[in-house]
Every structure is written in structure tokens, then in C-alpha cells.
């Protein structure tokens, strides 16, 4: 049977139906992909340009393949099995009235069905299956895949990868509230914040008094101690860790194969021997890399280092003096760690708004 030979897939909504708000269409496809990612190890990332594995489009009649749409009713959509080019793509008949309710044709339900084909599923003869060839309305808010659907998709891709549990090692390092405590790297990981130091990291939920500690090797045996920079792209469940001239990708708390990779593949010049700190700004969709007195800016959409970088930190981040140990993005602010202190920085107004102890996150 046809299936994708990789876990991380991209999709792009090439055009939008005028029947619905763009943001509703985006949300519906995000949720439709999530239906399948919830029961498999597959992960989906939305592209805004270029060719994606799964291209989604709305079209009337003839639209570039042999399978012309037939006007309102009849064929609602079609999708191709996995593979390059048109394969994997999902086409929706614009002659239908697409909705997010029981009226017209519910886009979410048809999307889940068509994306099933895009992932390699055939039609089912079980009327309870979303892969049954006849459309019928179900309430999207209570929608669940049938046992048949789960069994069929897992026969292609397996069950979801369980994230490893974060456990406390037997001998935690001593107290947080030590005056001179500094961190190697700090980043969010989902709802938690990870504070890396030497061979271990502390992690905690903001606002919760509990602090946990885990050795890096106990959760990720392939990741070295002494991580120097880290950032998270939460929308993709991706965590990037840096040490010297290498970086690692952790997906859903599971290290990706074929890593580490060279930092030079990201566009750094040969003069860069290590990254001091890194932070992803989700509003700008940029990663800021801090290296000595300079910083570099990386565009995650284009997967390219922005031109005209590096630039001086002191010029473009007023009030920030090198050298930087770690940077955390939290609630639209950057928290810039330098030794025993951290600066709360507002990137919108480009100014430092607070000076705090590095350990303030632990109630110190």
C-alpha cells in the first residue's frame, strides 16, 4: 500500500474558498490534520509558499488533472495517494457550499476523509468510518475516528510515539536560589520552561511552585551535556539544541534521526564556532542567534538566514550588553540571561523593562 516514507510532512493551502473566512479554513485544516497526527507518529507543518507534500486547493471543473469536478453535489473532493508531485494532494470542488456547520458541505469532515487518502487510506465499507465513500454530517466538535480508521492508519504508520516521561534523578544539584547561579540555555518546551545547566536541566510550569530536575542523558541519551543554546517552535512541537558547531532537533520530545547537523547549514559564517543563545519569536517567525557581540536572524518560513546579518547586539537591542548566556521568549517578552541576572526586554518598544535575578522563575 502507498504511504509516506517520512514522519514530518508539509502542507500548503494553495487557495481559499470564498465561502468561508480564511482563518476558519486554516483552523479546519489544522484540526483535520490533527485528527490523523493524534493517532500516528505523523507531524504536519503548514507552508505559505513553495511546493508542499500535500497541496490543498479549491477548484471548479477542470483543474490540472484528469478528474474534472462535476458542479454542485456529486463528487465533493478527491485526493491522491502519497508520493511526489500531485500525489498526496487534495482537491475540493468549489461548486459546493463549504461550511463549518451542518448546512452546505462541512469542510472539516470532507477534509479528514480526503487527508486520509493523502496519507494512503482507501475507502472503507464500514458506514461508521470517516473513509466511507458517502458524505454524512457528524458534529465536528464531538468527532472521533472509528476503531477501523485508527487500525487502518496505524497499519501504515504505527501508533503515536509516546514522549518520554520527565523523571527526577537520584541526586539533584543544590539549591536554585544561589546568588551566582547562571544557566547555559533556557527555553519553553510546550507549557514548561527548561533551564539547562551542565549535564542536567530544571523544568517547571510557570506559576507553579514545583520545580523538577532531570539529567539530559536520562531523557535523551544521544544529546550531550553542556548545551549552549536552545529554542522551541511550539506550533511544530520542535525543540532545537545547540552545542559548539552542531545542533540537534527534538520533535515531540523525541530526538530526530540524522542529527546532529552542522550549524553552518543554517547559514552561519565559518567564524562562528558556537552559539551563545537563541530564541524564536513566534510573532515575527524569526530565530535570533546571539554570538559574542553580534546576533544573526533566521527566517523559519524560508529556512534561510536573513541577509545583512550579523548585526551588533548593542545597536539593535538597546540596553543589552554582550555577552549573553541564554534567551527565553515568554508572553511577548525576551528574558535575556547574563550571569546571575536576567533582563526583561520588550521587542515591540525595543527597551529593557525589568532587571531580575536569573533564579526569579523559581520564586527566589
Amino acid at each position: 500500500r502507498s504511504r509516506w516514507m517520512k514522519r514530518y510532512l508539509t502542507y500548503r493551502i494553495y487557495n481559499y474558498t470564498p465561502d468561508m473566512k480564511r482563518e476558519d479554513v486554516d483552523y479546519i485544516f489544522q484540526k483535520a490534520f490533527q485528527v490523523w497526527s493524534d493517532v500516528t507518529p505523523l507531524r504536519f507543518r503548514k507552508l505559505h509558499k513553495d511546493e508542499a507534500d500535500i497541496m490543498i486547493l479549491f477548484a471548479f471543473g477542470a483543474h490540472g488533472d484528469f478528474n474534472y469536478f462535476d458542479g454542485k453535489g456529486g463528487t465533493l473532493a478527491h485526493a491522491f495517494y502519497p508520493g511526489p508531485g500531485i500525489q498526496g494532494d487534495a482537491h475540493f470542488d468549489e461548486a459546493e457550499t463549504w461550511t463549518k456547520s451542518f448546512q452546505g458541505t462541512n469542510l472539516f469532515l470532507v477534509a479528514v476523509h480526503e487527508l486520509g487518502h493523502s496519507l494512503g487510506l482507501q475507502h472503507s465499507n464500514n458506514p461508521k468510518s470517516i473513509m466511507y465513500p458517502t458524505y454524512r454530517y457528524l458534529n465536528p466538535s464531538t468527532f472521533r475516528l472509528s476503531a477501523d480508521d485508527i487500525r487502518n492508519i496505524q497499519s501504515l504508520y504505527g501508533a503515536p510515539v509516546k514522549p518520554p516521561s520527565l523523571t527526577k534523578p537520584s541526586s539533584p544539584p543544590s539549591t536554585f536560589c544561589h546568588q551566582s547561579l547562571s544557566f547555559d540555555a533556557v527555553t519553553t518546551v510546550g507549557e514548561k520552561i527548561f533551564f539547562f545547566k551542565d549535564w542536567f536541566f530544571w523544568w517547571k510550569l510557570p506559576g507553579s511552585p514545583a520545580t523538577n530536575i532531570t539529567s539530559i542523558s536520562s531523557i535523551w541519551p544521544s544529546i550531550p551535556s553542556g548545551i549552549q543554546a536552545a529554542y522551541e517552535i511550539e506550533s511544530r512541537n520542535q525543540l532545537f539544541l545547540f552545542k559548539d558547531e552542531k545542533y540537534w532537533l527534538i520533535n515531540n520530545l523525541v530526538p530526530e534521526p540524522h542529527y546532529p547537523r552542522s550549524i553552518y547549514s543554517l547559514g552561519f559564517s565559518a567564524s562562528v564556532k558556537k552559539v551563545d543563545a537563541a530564541v524564536f519569536d513566534p510573532l515575527r517567525q524569526k530565530v535570533y542567534f546571539f554570538v559574542d557581540k553580534h546576533y544573526w536572524r533566521y527566517d523559519v518560513r524560508q529556512e534561510l538566514m536573513d541577509p545583512a546579518y550579523p548585526k551588533l547586539i548593542s545597536t539593535h537591542f538597546p540596553g543589552i550588553k554582550p555577552k549573553i548566556d541564554a534567551v527565553l521568549y515568554f508572553k511577548r517578552h525576551y528574558y535575556i540571561f547574563q550571569g546571575a541576572y536576567q533582563l526583561e526586554y520588550d521587542p515591540l518598544f525595543r527597551r529593557v523593562t525589568k532587571t531580575l535575578k536569573s533564579t526569579s522563575w523559581f520564586g527566589c
Partner: antibody, heavy 122, light 103 residues
């Protein structure tokens, strides 16, 4: 290695019939859409007909509709084109071409046979 | 019905030249455009699919771009073996072909 080998071409009089075959090997034939494409002497390429993996769905160019019939025998890994009521303008090299997997045909022809020449002349 | 217009119909160039062939659809075909190369007496060979994806085994001097209605095939530095006829295609519609000849 994917191989497509056409046969059955030849000289036929206007109004006559001919059946072309395409023997496929090197891939799971029953999974793939297949097409016939032709090329008149000194002219460009013209798509003729397509068929789904099961044989249940077919399509034809307007120029051959009602006269040509595409079929397949998955047990023999063979594609066919039955050509009736042949005309002088059907003179061409006929190629069979492998399309993508699955229920729908795309016209992405990644492998072609060497072709077989059909000449319609009195 | 969708129609494909390819230009130029013929083109003379020299080894080492950069060559561009264009293909235009009369309505959007998104990125569903393929390019084929055909040498005399031979079957066509797939070069580019989905407008810009290079078929396995095809030299990197060939590239494709475009989406919607306008597409191009570019050969960055012509080699002697590139002199052939090139066709754009989507589903059952082929362009008229571009014959690339040695100047």
C-alpha cells in the same frame, strides 16, 4: 527496472481495426493508472486514452471517443488499445505510459515505452 | 477546456547558453505542469514534474518554475546532448513543443 513494450502496430486500411498491447514489467502494474499517447509523423504529442488501476474508470480524447477502447489485464501485466474505424489521421507512433498510483489519474508520465507505429493507408 | 501554449516553437542556441522555454495555460493549473524531453526516434522522457521538481536522474542544469498559468523551463548551460524537442504538459494536454537546435 521499469519496462513497457508496445506491440501490435502495422499497416491497416481506413475503416479497419487494430489492437495494440503494452507488456509491463518492473513495477506492480495493478497499482498504477496507465495511458496511451500518440505522435503523428513530424508532429507533437497527443494524449489518447487512460485507464485506472482496476480498469473501472477510463477516459478518451475527443478525437478517438467512440472508436477506441482501452482495457487492461492485471493478471498478465498488459495494457491494450482496441482501435476501430481507423482513419488516415490516426497514423502515428503509439506509446504506452505509466501514470501514478491510486484511484485518480494525473497525467504524470514517468515511464514510456518505445512506441509502435500504426499506419492507416489504402 | 484547458489549453497550453508553448513558446517559442523553435530555438537556436549554442553550447553553454542559458535557454528559457515558456508555457502558458488559459486558466489556472496550479502547479500541475510537467516538462518532457524527446530526442529523434526516441520516446519522451520526464524532466520536471509539478512545475519545479526535478525528476530523478535529470541533471541539475534543468529547472522549472511557475504556478497558476505561467511556467518556464530553464537550461542553465546547454550541453550537446540537450538539443532535442521539449514539451510542456498537464493531464491530457501537451504544448505544441519547442525544437531546440544548434546555432
Amino acid at each position: 527496472e521499469v519496462q513497457l513494450l508496445e506491440s501490435g502496430g502495422g499497416l491497416v486500411q481506413p475503416g479497419g481495426s487494430l489492437r495494440l498491447s503494452c507488456a509491463a514489467s518492473g513495477f506492480t502494474f495493478s497499482w498504477y493508472n496507465m495511458s496511451w499517447v500518440r505522435q503523428a509523423p513530424g508532429k507533437g504529442l497527443e494524449w489518447v486514452s487512460r485507464i485506472s488501476p482496476s480498469g473501472g474508470d477510463t477516459g478518451y480524447a475527443d478525437s478517438v471517443k467512440g472508436r477506441f477502447t482501452i482495457s487492461r489485464d492485471n493478471s498478465k501485466n498488459t495494457l491494450y488499445l482496441q482501435m476501430n474505424s481507423l482513419r488516415a489521421e490516426d497514423t502515428a507512433v503509439y506509446y504506452c505510459a505509466k501514470d501514478i498510483r491510486g484511484a485518480y489519474s494525473s497525467g504524470l508520465f514517468d515511464y514510456w515505452g518505445r512506441g509502435t507505429l500504426v499506419t492507416v493507408s489504402s | 477546456d484547458i489549453q497550453m501554449t508553448q513558446s517559442p516553437s523553435s530555438l537556436s542556441a549554442s553550447v553553454g547558453d542559458r535557454v528559457t522555454i515558456t508555457c502558458r495555460a488559459n486558466q489556472s493549473i496550479y502547479t500541475y505542469l510537467n516538462w518532457y524531453q524527446q530526442k529523434p526516434g526516441k520516446a519522451p522522457e520526464l524532466l520536471i514534474y509539478a512545475a519545479s521538481s526535478l525528476q530523478s536522474g535529470v541533471p541539475s542544469r534543468f529547472s522549472g518554475s511557475g504556478s497558476g498559468t505561467d511556467f518556464t523551463l530553464t537550461i542553465s548551460s546547454l550541453q550537446p546532448e540537450d538539443f532535442a524537442t521539449y514539451y510542456c504538459q498537464q493531464a491530457g494536454i501537451f504544448g505544441q513543443g519547442t525544437k531546440l537546435e544548434i546555432k
